[in-house]
Amino acid sequence: SSCGQVKCRKGEQCVHTASGPRCFCPSPRDCESGCASSPCQHGGSCHPQRQPPYYSCQCAPPFSGSRCELYTAPPSTPPATCLSQYCADKARDGVCDEACNSHACQWDGGDCSLTMENPWANCSSPLPCWDYINNQCDELCNTVECLFDNFECQGNSKTCKYDKYCADHFKDNHCDQGCNSEECGWDGLDCAADQPENLAEGTLVIVVLMPPEQLLQDARSFLRALGTLLHTNLRIKRDSQGELMVYPYYGEKSAAMKKQRMTRRSLPGEQEQEVAGSKVFLEIDNRQCVQDSDHCFKNTDAAAALLASHAIQGTLSYPLVSVVSESLTPERTQ
């Protein structure tokens, strides 16, 4: 019904009030619900109302506003501090001290975060997203720069139904449809062999405390474990000769290690350099990820940061020491 200049929507009635004509909904059942457009943001719940705008939002803290669009920092949150002297002494010694494993302490100077002092450096969310790894979806952190809220907005709890079987048959050049799902790592792309690759830009350079021969022997499990964390597929990069880019790693010459070597006399015939682990170059292949998800890494920067985030949480199943994202394609760098 029309009411002077005011046009009322279907099911609404025109009411003349002291402040002029107004539309009114006598029975919300018969009117277009204001909630139909999902106006309440950040997990707020929507309740239909009889008067414009025909909805009200009940916001989840720390959000407010008519559409829960406003973020209000809790006033009681004290500024994060670092146990200054203790953590200053312990930072960058290669050992993760939980008491220093905080944003304020740069994750123990990188000791807890694969040497990356701020995995959330590119995250511009008003929320401190490192504090919102809480098994619930925080949409303000659900961006690639904020590491997809640790994948908590897309049913993170889904587990691979036939995990043992799928682990044993991962990337074995035989398609097992029961394993061809995101939570099972898409069977290591065994079911997508005929599809073109979809490589993310860049290379993940990972140092892991396993000698090259052991890592190559365990490569399928290693790639599956990291792929599961990143919700995509990984492969070992090949050099210009077609060789897998897995190299012996001899360890950083940290102050602690130099000191240790000085106090330990070399025995005759003892090798000057011991292999401490491997340096492995990995590529991300999103060919399946892009079909099933909009949470895929276009480049390796955020993927490296997400691995660092898992290190902070202590959820890595391999002894990774460091992770770096390289945007160029380097020939073997030691």
């Epitope: 001290d97 939980e98 008491a99 807890c112 002894p319």
Partner: antibody
Framework: EVQLVESGGGLVQPGGSLRLSCAAS????????MSWVRQAPGKGLEWVSY????????YYADSVKGRFTISADTSKNTAYLQMNSLRAEDTAVYYC???????????????WGQGTLVTVSS | DIQMTQSPSSLSASVGDRVTITCRAS??????LAWYQQKPGKAPKLLIY???RRASGVPSRFSGSGSGTDFTLTISSLQPEDFATYYC?????????FGQGTKVEIK
């Protein structure tokens, strides 16, 4: 099978020195931190020292700082505890124990050796 | 340093009893707490880590709970092989510290 075997304990006079060894097998020695924990006769457990073999980083209890030195030889998969200026109160069974979380001192000790007895007495 | 205080120091119980041991920390160590079992002349054995997670091979009658400063180890139905001394340990910050132990004896 993951195994830790201590050796080197014995009787020593106050002010003397002793070196304990802990031979590790069945896992990647470089990847996991190792602690020494001691237990005086009839008493409770006391943490002594920690080392992360990969980086060589070390931690000590105040009671032994400056007297004890922890080290690791990654080529031999062995951790050591060099004990100098020994006192009667250092008398204890010394255990080496592996930490469960790779490079984290903030992790529980999931594998223990059988212990070696150190007696400091004149 | 974080002081760990266990109670009771000792207790007598019968096979089949439900036993509860508590451990209080002088400051919060979040959930970075372990429980160990030690039998005479033997090395300690890890039972619980992360305050509530059972170590591999540990029977389900052992359970842990708590966070912050107050923690509990519960043995739901005491078995003959459970008579031993139990220690709590915080591993949140160095120096790592143990409780003084709780001896569980046969009544």
């Amino acid at each position: 099978e993951v195994q830790l075997v201590e050796s080197g304990g014995g009787l020593v006079q106050p002010g003397g020195s002793l070196r304990l060894s802990c031979a590790a097998s069945g896992y990647s020695f470089t990847s996991y931190g190792m602690s020494w924990v001691r237990q005086a006769p009839g008493k409770g457990l006391e943490w002594v020292s920690y080392i992360y073999p990969y980086s060589g980083a070390t931690y000590y209890a105040d009671s032994v700082k400056g007297r004890f030195t922890i080290s690791a030889d990654t080529s031999k998969n062995t951790a050591y505890l060099q004990m100098n200026s020994l006192r009667a109160e250092d008398t204890a069974v010394y255990y080496c124990a592996r930490h469960s979380g790779y490079y984290r001192i903030s992790s529980a000790m999931d594998v223990w050796g059988q212990g070696t007895l150190v007696t400091v007495s004149s | 340093d974080i002081q760990m205080t266990q109670s009771p120091s000792s207790l007598s119980a019968s096979v089949g009893d439900r036993v509860t041991i508590t451990c209080r920390a002088s400051q919060s160590n979040r959930r970075f707490l372990a429980w160990y079992q030690q039998k005479p002349g033997k090395a300690p054995k890890l039972l619980i880590y992360g305050a509530s997670r059972r170590a591999s091979g540990v029977p389900s009658r052992f359970s842990g709970s708590g966070s912050g400063t107050d923690f509990t180890l519960t043995i739901s139905s005491l078995q003959p092989e459970d008579f031993a001394t139990y220690y709590c340990q915080q591993y949140y910050i160095s120096p790592l510290t143990f409780g003084q132990g709780t001896k569980v004896e046969i009544k």
